[in-house]
């Protein structure tokens, strides 16, 4: 079991993740672990020498880079916010700000846009991952209503008048709640849509 550096005639190395082929000397050398970079290249008699990334820089993977990548903040102008800081082993972790979804993706989200409103009588279908796509509005299920235009409002169950010792004056719809009234009082026309106690 040879340890780097070792000769390789077929230009491949045993451990592709942690070793790389160095064509000048036709040898396999060690890559540097995450959080480090190559400070001295390998030779036939000496393996790669690695050094820790300086503050504000990182390398995420086993590498044979001679520099670390500069940490960059998430861009609030593009609708992004930070969920985790940059460290020597990972870049800054970003996500779309609340009420936004990812509109442009290039290995990671680069641009977020405002979620569309769902009209009354509908709500946004719940997604596995927040911020991944725009709202898909679905009708409120039976017995529920939603009376605003909003990207985030949820359908609520209709009020059950009997639970409050009242009777139904007007049934609920997908866009409005049940109207209740006191069983002893008739509901004047101008009071429709309100709850009389």
């Amino acid at each position: 079991q040879a340890v780097p550096p070792y000769a390789s005639e077929n230009q491949t190395c045993r451990d592709q993740e942690k070793e790389y082929y160095e064509p000048q000397h036709r040898i396999c050398c060690s890559r540097c672990p995450p959080g480090t970079y190559v400070s001295a290249k390998c030779s036939r008699i000496r393996d790669t020498v690695c050094a820790t990334c300086a503050e504000n820089s990182y390398n995420e993977h086993w590498n044979y880079l001679t520099i670390c990548q500069l940490c960059r903040p998430c861009d609030p102008v593009m609708g992004l916010e930070e969920i985790a800081p940059c460290t020597s082993k990972r870049k800054t972790q970003c996500r779309c700000q609340p009420g936004m979804f990812c509109a442009a993706w290039a290995l990671e989200c680069t641009h977020c846009e405002l979620l569309s409103d769902c009209p009354p009588g509908t709500e946004a279908e719940l997604k596995d991952e927040v911020g991944k796509g725009n709202n898909h509005c679905v009708p409120c299920k039976a017995g529920h209503f939603q009376n605003t235009s909003s990207p985030s409002a949820r359908c609520q169950p209709h009020t059950r008048c009997e639970n409050q010792g009242l009777v139904e004056a007007a049934p609920g719809t997908a866009q409005s709640d049940t109207t209740c009234k006191n069983p002893l009082e008739p509901l004047p026309p101008e009071m429709s849509g309100t709850m009389l106690m």
């Epitope: 503050e55 504000n56 903040p73 985790a84 800081p85 460290t87 972790q93």
Partner: antibody, heavy 116, light 107 residues
Framework: QVQLVQSGAEVKKPGESVKVSCKAS????????LHWVRQAPGQGLEWMGW????????QYNEKFKGRVTITADKSTSTAYMELSSLRSEDTAVYYC?????????WGQGTTVTVSS | DIQMTQSPSSLSASVGDRVTITCKAS??????VAWYQQKPGKAPKLLIS???YRYSGVPSRFSGSGSGTDFTLTISSLQPEDFATYFC?????????FGQGTKVEIK
């Protein structure tokens, strides 16, 4: 060498606001995050939020959202933390700190006392 | 938010003793944990970052270990200047959170 020098102690009444400053030197102010952390008497440490002076963007701990504002003045390499609607529970030492895999650099702390 | 539960809350020890302080995260934080020492009236001082890397100028008697949810700070041979309060902190995700502290007192 990196230095963070904070403004002096403050005594405030409930409902008032306080603004604490943190002057940075010894490094490029615009390329490092500056955080604010507070410590109530005899208590632990509580992270409040950060500012990235390069673009002026700040993010806050939800607990303080709406009450805390962190700003930075690039021309003087100074960060500010303003806390409004003060209550007695806000009596604490407030620290600014520069981050990198933890907080290697801290200000000396500013004592804020809230008392009627 | 991630909770950092530190134990013990206080301990009494003698010069030369080996002291161990533990910190448990409520969810996986990888190795993104720092340890601090704080003396009365002073700002905290960074001892360990990335769970086990000693910060520059920190004596070799301080060591850190752990990953995921369980972390340990060890002082191999307690010195008079080590009597202080120690805090752990996770910087894996926002909001950053700290342990409640361990006060190391003279026996």
């Amino acid at each position: 060498q990196v230095q963070l020098v904070q403004s002096g102690a403050e005594v405030k009444k409930p409902g008032e606001s306080v603004k604490v400053s943190c002057k940075a030197s010894g490094y490029t102010f615009t390329t490092y995050y500056l955080h604010w952390v507070r410590q109530a008497p005899g208590q632990g440490l509580e992270w409040m939020g950060w500012i990235y002076p390069g673009n002026g963007h700040a993010q806050y701990n939800e607990k303080f959202k709406g009450r805390v504002t962190i700003t930075a003045d690039k021309s003087t390499s100074t960060a500010y933390m303003e806390l409004s609607s003060l209550r007695s529970e806000d009596t604490a030492v407030y620290y600014c700190a520069r981050s990198w895999e933890g907080f290697p650099y801290w200000g000396q702390g500013t004592t804020v006392t809230v008392s009627s | 938010d991630i909770q950092m539960t530190q134990s013990p809350s206080s301990l009494s020890a003698s010069v030369g003793d080996r002291v161990t302080i533990t910190c448990k995260a409520s969810q996986n934080v990888g190795i993104n944990v720092a340890w601090y020492q704080q003396k009365p009236g002073k700002a905290p001082k960074l001892l360990i970052s990335s769970a086990s890397y000693r910060y520059s100028g920190v004596p070799s008697r301080f060591s850190g270990s752990g990953s995921g949810t369980d972390f340990t700070l060890t002082i191999s041979s307690l010195q008079p200047e080590d009597f202080a309060t120690y805090f752990c902190q996770q910087y894996d995700t926002y909001p950053f959170t700290f342990g409640q502290g361990t006060k190391v007192e003279i026996k």
